[in-house]
């Protein structure tokens, strides 16, 4: 399955919007920083084929979308930027979903990447737990925003490596 040429441009636009969403200086939230244990190995792109990689990327984008479409998220961010950000994510989800479906049709087994998807789910569980513990404070959201920028940029790198493999 070939992702549309525009897909990596959408990724960069998503990152740009997330960067613009910053409301307070991260430097005022130094003590709130947290290691969420991003499952780096699932995004290294060396040890697995394209099909599982796409479904792990899909899971990552889906979880980010879920996180930023909550009621608490709406209260934390600029409405217009949040709306644009979520629209971009939704578009990427559609692109990735079409690829996931196509791979399933040609018989790619979903079992081969179940562990990777579980690792992504656990990562977002840790993020949600952190936000809850910090009572969705502005600094907690700022820390999460920086973390999502890191994971999004890593996933962008993976997608570009996958495209080069085609």
């Amino acid at each position: 399955c070939d992702l549309p040429e525009t897909h990596s441009l959408d990724n960069r636009r998503t990152l740009m919007l997330l960067a613009q969403m910053s409301r307070i200086s991260p430097s005022s939230c130094l003590m709130d920083r947290h290691d969420f244990g991003f499952p780096q190995e699932e995004f290294d792109g060396n040890q697995f084929q394209k099909a599982p990689a796409i479904s792990v990327l899909h899971e990552l984008i889906q979880q980010i979308f879920n996180l930023f479409t909550t009621k608490d998220s709406s209260a934390a961010w600029d409405e217009d930027l949040l709306d644009k950000f979520c629209t971009e994510l939704y578009q990427q989800l559609n692109d990735l979903e079409a690829c996931v479906m196509q791979e399933e049709r040609v018989g790619e087994t979903p079992l081969m990447n179940a562990d990777s998807i579980l690792a992504v789910k656990k990562y977002f569980r840790r993020i949600t737990l952190y936000l809850t513990e910090k009572k969705y404070s502005p600094c907690a959201w700022e820390v999460v925003r920086a973390e999502i920028m890191r994971s999004l940029s890593l996933s962008t790198n993976l997608q570009e490596r996958l495209r080069r493999k085609e």
Epitope: S22, S25, S27, L30, H34
Partner: antibody
């Protein structure tokens, strides 16, 4: 590729002000924090402060709060640092550096440095 | 401010041997799983270059002979085996709290 092009050598009188520039290319200027670092001849490095070009947000080392002023012009992809009330202690090389990995606050790309010499 | 004390101030190491540089912080720079200590290399007449971030993560493109370790207040940069091109001054930097500060540097000479 990422490049940070700094303005050239500056010679200034004690008490004067100087404004140096750092033109960024090869990346999205508005989405990366930009640090400024001082290095006196034969000495170590000192962190002056950081600016977020996207919204002009700044954070300073208290030591430089009344000495340095950080600004950015996004349309020109350029960050600026103005130093005021210059003394001999301000004679140094000043680097602009791009922030790395968001809130890890480390520096991956460095400009070539602007040499400021304060002399009467 | 957190003071970073680097030792030794200078060292001379034979080609192929191990160079060990220490950086001690006056206060812990580790929090919630991350150690906010980073290492740079500066060669004469050049700009500093990022080697290691978050105490032990090797920056992309940096040779694997460089490694970092430590947490809390004590951190170490190891270079093994040392090569000719490693002659430089090495600085640690923390980003645990404001203001960010650098160590005074360690000058490495290759014998």
């Amino acid at each position: 590729q990422v490049q940070l092009q700094e303005s050239g050598t500056v010679l200034a009188r004690p008490g004067a002000s100087v404004k140096m520039s750092c033109k960024a290319s090869g990346y999205s200027f508005t989405t990366y924090w930009m640090h400024w670092v001082k290095q006196r001849p034969g000495q170590g490095l000192e962190w002056i402060g950081v600016i977020y070009p996207g919204n002009g947000d700044t954070t300073y080392n208290q030591k430089f709060k009344d000495k340095a002023k950080l600004t950015a012009v996004t349309s020109a992809n350029t960050a600026y640092m103005e130093l005021s009330s210059l003394t001999n202690e301000d004679s140094a090389v000043y680097f602009c550096t791009r922030n790395y990995k968001y809130d890890y606050y480390t520096m991956d790309y460095w400009g070539q440095g602007t040499t400021v010499t304060v002399s009467s | 401010d957190i003071v970073l004390t680097q030792s030794p101030a200078s060292l001379a190491v034979s080609l192929g041997q191990r160079a060990t540089i220490s950086c001690r912080a006056s206060k812990s720079v580790s929090t919630s799983g991350h150690s906010y200590m980073h290492w740079y290399q500066q060669k004469p007449g050049q700009t500093p270059k990022l080697l290691i971030y978050l105490a032990s993560n090797l920056e992309s493109g940096v040779p694997a002979r460089f490694s970092g370790s430590g947490s809390g207040t004590d951190f170490t940069l190891n270079i093994h085996p040392v090569e000719e091109e490693d002659a430089a001054t090495y600085y640690c930097q923390h980003s645990g709290e404001l203001p960010f500060t650098f160590g005074s540097g360690t000058k490495l000479e290759i014998k």
